[in-house]
Interface confidence: low
């Protein structure tokens, strides 16, 4: 086919000297010689689709996927990976070929998958598919840690079945809430698998290797704390181990703790107790309830009772498969230019999600915070008042979730004007979307107040730029108008902006900015 572009797909392997994550780039770092990936047309596919040879990458290796396009004129492009759009900046090499690159630094499991590159040239549109897999995927894993009781000892072992062998650490904190954040001075870390000091307020175990870091918190009911307004809920998948700790402090040792599941005492061997005196001579008791591998019938209300404290419960829910619960309906916001505002997604999920916020093909880090009601929230405030579409994407191995937001910024129109031999066009991205007027400037009307009633064609919101609507108005020129100045004005509830255009000028020639 004569119209098909001549394209070449190559792989460039890099020496590892960087620690950031995959990104699109037009200037990859200095590297080894490129390896041809032999892009071939995919038969029987809708549209023009090229497929590159599958790329196998070692964990932590860095590579560049590159496409060289021999096609006349400009090209525009878009990378898409796992439903997220990534920035794409084509440039031209010395042979005037279009060059598009995707750099993947420090390859991890999350960066494996299908990378789609959409290219639009003046002649045609086409798609290039790269499949990137991790070499020895089966050998490299990072699993969330879980707890086991140490044989014949009152101690917990933290286990993470991961390859390469992970570094396991206990993260301990004796404060409440915010002061137990990872880098707080109240937090103590112990790089060991076994923990004997099980009386602390907040106990987590974390495992890390080349693939990242995963943590598990020891679920705790504290009978000395005021119960939450909503019942605490613990989710587990069938086969996972269950650990719940009940903790109580009293002035002396004269009290006991018991666990019940749905008003029935737990079986012998499903719990163990520890006690100690604190520095002020009060007695601390903890009672663990545990099930080495949960089944559906382990679901229910687990209640910890004390002879000296009000009892408290937690709802344990055993699920077959992980989930992400949230409302996925799109939400539209409109705010003033300097108003403080954050997007927010409230969700309930198990296992914990990994998430990203995306705007204008750029991914932003995603933080999540647990709420008291069992839900979590992720907020995004770094929009810098840029209007458009924002995407929240979350996944946890079992489920995926995407939510769209649109941000409109209230502002008066700003007009861009251009003229051709037969027409003059003005466009504006003000919000609310502006209305248009055209005026003629003449000897009779030096202030450009004479209306142009005919030949005007308005298009509202016909073009979306990253979700941002644009309004435009076009004036078709009559012979009688040539050589005249005309003025297009866009107005909305926040103001008016105008541009003056000389008709029949050789090129775009807006020359008076008039507000």
């Amino acid at each position: 086919n004569q119209d098909l572009p001549v394209i070449k797909c190559v792989l460039i392997n890099h020496k590892n000297n960087d620690s950031s994550v995959g990104k699109s780039s037009s200037y990859p770092m200095v590297s080894e010689s490129p390896e041809d990936l032999g892009c071939a047309l995919r038969p029987q596919s809708a549209g023009t689709v090229y497929e590159a040879a599958t790329v196998e990458v070692d964990v932590s290796a860095s590579i560049t996927l590159q496409v060289l396009v021999d096609t006349p004129g400009n090209i525009s492009c878009l990378w898409v990976f796992k439903h997220s759009s990534l920035n794409c900046q084509p440039h031209f090499d010395v042979q005037n070929r279009g060059v598009v690159s995707m750099v993947i630094l420090k390859m991890t499991e999350t960066q494996a998958g299908e990378y789609l590159l959409f290219i639009q040239s003046e002649a045609t549109n086409y798609t290039i598919v790269f499949t990137v897999s991790i070499r020895n995927t089966l050998l490299f894993t990072l699993r969330r840690p879980y707890f086991r009781k140490m044989e014949n000892q009152d101690a917990l072992v933290c286990i993470s079945e991961s390859v390469p062998e992970p570094i396991v650490e206990w993260v301990l904190c004796d404060s409440q809430g915010e002061s137990c954040k990872e880098e707080s001075p109240a937090v103590v870390k112990k790089e060991e698998k076994v923990l004997h000091e099980l009386f602390g307020t907040d106990i987590r175990c974390c495992a890390r290797n080349e693939l990242g870091r995963e943590c598990t918190r020891l679920f705790t009911i504290d009978l000395n704390q005021t119960p939450q307004t909503t019942l605490p809920q613990l989710f587990l998948k069938v086969g996972e181990p269950l650990w719940i700790r009940c903790k109580a402090v009293h002035v002396n040792h004269g009290f006991g703790l018991t666990w019940e599941l749905e008003n029935k005492a737990l079986e012998e061997g499903s719990y163990f107790e520890m006690s100690t005196y604190s520095t002020n001579r009060t007695m601390i008791r903890i009672l663990f309830a545990f099930v080495s591998s949960v089944a559906r019938n382990d679901t229910g209300y687990y209640t910890c009772s004390s002879s000296k404290h009000p009892s408290q419960s937690a709802l344990v829910t055993i699920v077959e498969k992980g989930f992400i619960n949230a409302t996925n309906s799109s939400e539209d916001y409109e705010i003033d230019q300097y108003e403080e505002f954050c997007f927010s997604v409230r969700f309930k999920a198990y296992p914990q999600i990994r998430c990203t916020w995306t705007f204008s093909r750029k991914a932003f880090p995603c933080e999540q915070k647990a709420l008291d009601d069992g839900y979590s929230v992720s907020k995004f405030c770094n929009h810098k008042h840029q209007p458009g579409e924002y995407i929240f994407h979350a996944e946890n191995g079992d489920a995926q979730f995407t939510k769209m937001f649109t941000l409109n910024i209230r502002r008066k129109p700003q007009v861009l004007a251009e003229a051709s031999a037969s027409q003059a066009s003005c466009s504006s991205d003000g919000y609310p979307l502006p209305s248009w007027t055209w005026k003629k400037c003449s000897d009779k009307s030096p202030n450009c107040t004479e209306d142009i009633p005919e030949g005007v064609w308005n298009r509202k919101a016909n073009r979306k730029v990253f979700g941002q609507w644009v309004s435009s108005s076009t004036l078709n020129m009559s012979e009688a108008m040539k050589g005249f100045l005309v003025k297009c004005c866009a107005y909305n509830s926040l103001g008016t902006s105008c541009e003056t255009i000389l008709l029949n000028s050789p090129g775009p020639f807006p020359f008076i900015q008039d507000s």
Epitope: T327, S329, S330, E331, D332, Y333, E334, I335, F341, N408, R410, Y431, P432, L433, N492, S493
Partner: nanobody, 125 residues
Framework: EVQLLESGGGLVQPGGSLTLSCAAS????????MGWFRQAPGKEREFVAA????????YYADSVKGRFTISRDNSKNTLYLQMNSLRAEDTAVYYC??????????????????WGQGTLVTVSS
């Protein structure tokens, strides 16, 4: 607290028209995104139409697009729903709703902060 009071409901023949009004008690009416929802007997409450606080954006359920028009008069603190070409399946209690924050567009019930009492629209011959 915003109080919302709907009016304009009643019995109308298929193909007929009706205009619902929703009067808001608060002067800050203009800073809320407003919407209409409806609930037919034995069914869940569903979104009908919404309009952003500036009037810059309107939203319609597919089932009413082209037949219903939402508008607002911020000077009168009033929201309107002009319903044309009414069908039997439009029979429901129609509720006026105000956005959960001053900015969110009300297209789903979780983000509604204030509800009206509802006005009954019956389409029948």
């Amino acid at each position: 607290e915003v109080q919302l009071l709907e009016s304009g409901g009643g019995l109308v023949q298929p193909g007929g028209s009706l205009t619902l009004s929703c009067a808001a008690s608060e002067r800050t009416f203009s800073s809320y995104t407003m919407g209409w929802f409806r609930q037919a007997p034995g069914k869940e409450r569903e979104f009908v139409a919404a309009m952003s606080w500036s009037g810059g954006s309107t939203y319609y359920a597919d089932s009413v697009k082209g037949r219903f028009t939402i508008s607002r008069d911020n000077s009168k603190n009033t929201l309107y729903l002009q319903m044309n070409s009414l069908r039997a399946e439009d029979t429901a209690v129609y509720y006026c709703a105000a956005g959960g924050s001053t900015r969110v567009v009300v297209t789903t019930t979780p983000v509604v902060k204030y509800w009206g009492q509802g006005t009954l629209v019956t389409v029948s011959s």
